[in-house]
């Protein structure tokens, strides 16, 4: 089921729509897998949610504080003047910890960035072409990093040599789809929270 | 410290069967999907079939129908029945996870043959 379009405010705290944007692309691109990809473990009943930021990452710590704590009086003291080149902190004096969450949440979709890509790559190469990212998808990965823009080293797609493993790769697929989509209504209560705030 | 051991391997004759054992640590095991592999002389890995912690299991097409994925939660261990067993399977099996592998085991040598 497509989520409802939204229409934002044209003043509205940039990043929001593009953490919509990302929302309703990963759960079209999830829906498109659970149905091409029938006969592998791909619906949520199925599969295990398993986090490739796990230990490397730590949005759900960074960003929680923000929405618990009302009263930033404790956070007051160590606000900084940091402001990324991107649009989301435009302008703003941040608390430590909102540029934590969303420094955390940049580090998160480079990381998923780099899995999809790398997927995709064996999947484009897939005689069966069964299954292939959705490019909408890909592009608003890039908009939400682009506008949240931390001054961080590009990775480089995983380039390899080796035969692709196809089945893997569909089995592996499913498993990121859904971790990145409940990732994604992360960031998305995130930006909600501090378009509101 | 040990995180993943393969065992069961042997030689068999075409037709055959083997049932291959595989005993992981908790941290890897619990909660992940795990997959058997195989590997043989100058070839890659591949994945051969997946188990997901709640045993929903999917295999590649060239064992599909012969070989059989299951686990124990409780014994953190995962196992590959094969049966009809062909010489193209001769192969190193190896178990581990599907997302974030792990460091790998020795692996267990079948080799089928007459």
């Known amino acids: 089921r497509n989520l409802p379009v939204a229409t934002p405010d044209p003043g509205m705290f940039p990043c929001l729509h593009h953490s919509q944007n990302l929302l309703r692309a990963v759960s079209n691109m999830l829906q498109k897998a659970r149905q091409t990809l029938e006969f592998y473990p791909c619906t949520s009943e199925e599969i295990d949610h398993e986090d490739i930021t796990k230990d490397k990452t730590s949005t759900v710590e960074a960003c929680l504080p923000l929405e618990l704590t009302k009263n930033e009086s404790c956070l007051n003291s160590r606000e900084t003047s940091f402001i990324t080149n991107g649009s989301c902190l435009a302008s703003r004096k941040t608390s430590f910890m909102m540029a934590l969450c969303l420094s955390s949440i940049y580090e998160d979709l480079k990381m998923y960035q780099v899995e999809f890509k790398t997927m995709n790559a064996k999947l484009l190469m897939d005689p069966k072409r069964q299954i292939f990212l959705d490019q909408n998808m890909l592009a608003v990965i890039d908009e939400l990093m682009q506008a949240l823009n931390f001054n961080s080293e590009t990775v480089p797609q995983k380039s390899s040599l080796e035969e692709p493993d196809f089945y893997k790769t569909k089995i592996k697929l499913c498993i990121l789809l859904h971790a990145f989509r409940i990732r994604a209504v992360t960031i998305d209560r995130v930006m909600s929270y501090l378009n509101a705030s | 410290e040990v995180q993943l051991v393969e065992s069961g391997g042997g030689l068999v004759q075409p037709g055959g069967s083997l049932r291959l054992p595989c005993v992981a640590s908790?941290?890897?095991?619990?909660?992940?999907?795990m997959g058997w592999y195989r590997q043989t002389p100058g070839k890659q890995r591949e994945l051969v079939a997946s188990i997901t912690s709640r045993g929903y299991t999917s295999y590649a097409d060239s064992v599909k129908g012969r070989f059989t994925i299951s686990r124990d939660n409780a014994k953190n261990t995962v196992y590959l029945q094969m049966n009809s067993l062909k010489p193209e399977d001769t192969a190193v099996y190896y178990c581990n996870r599907i997302v974030v592998e792990s460091q790998w085991g020795q692996g267990t040598q079948v080799t089928v043959s007459s």
């Open positions: 908790g941290s890897i095991f619990r909660g992940n999907t």
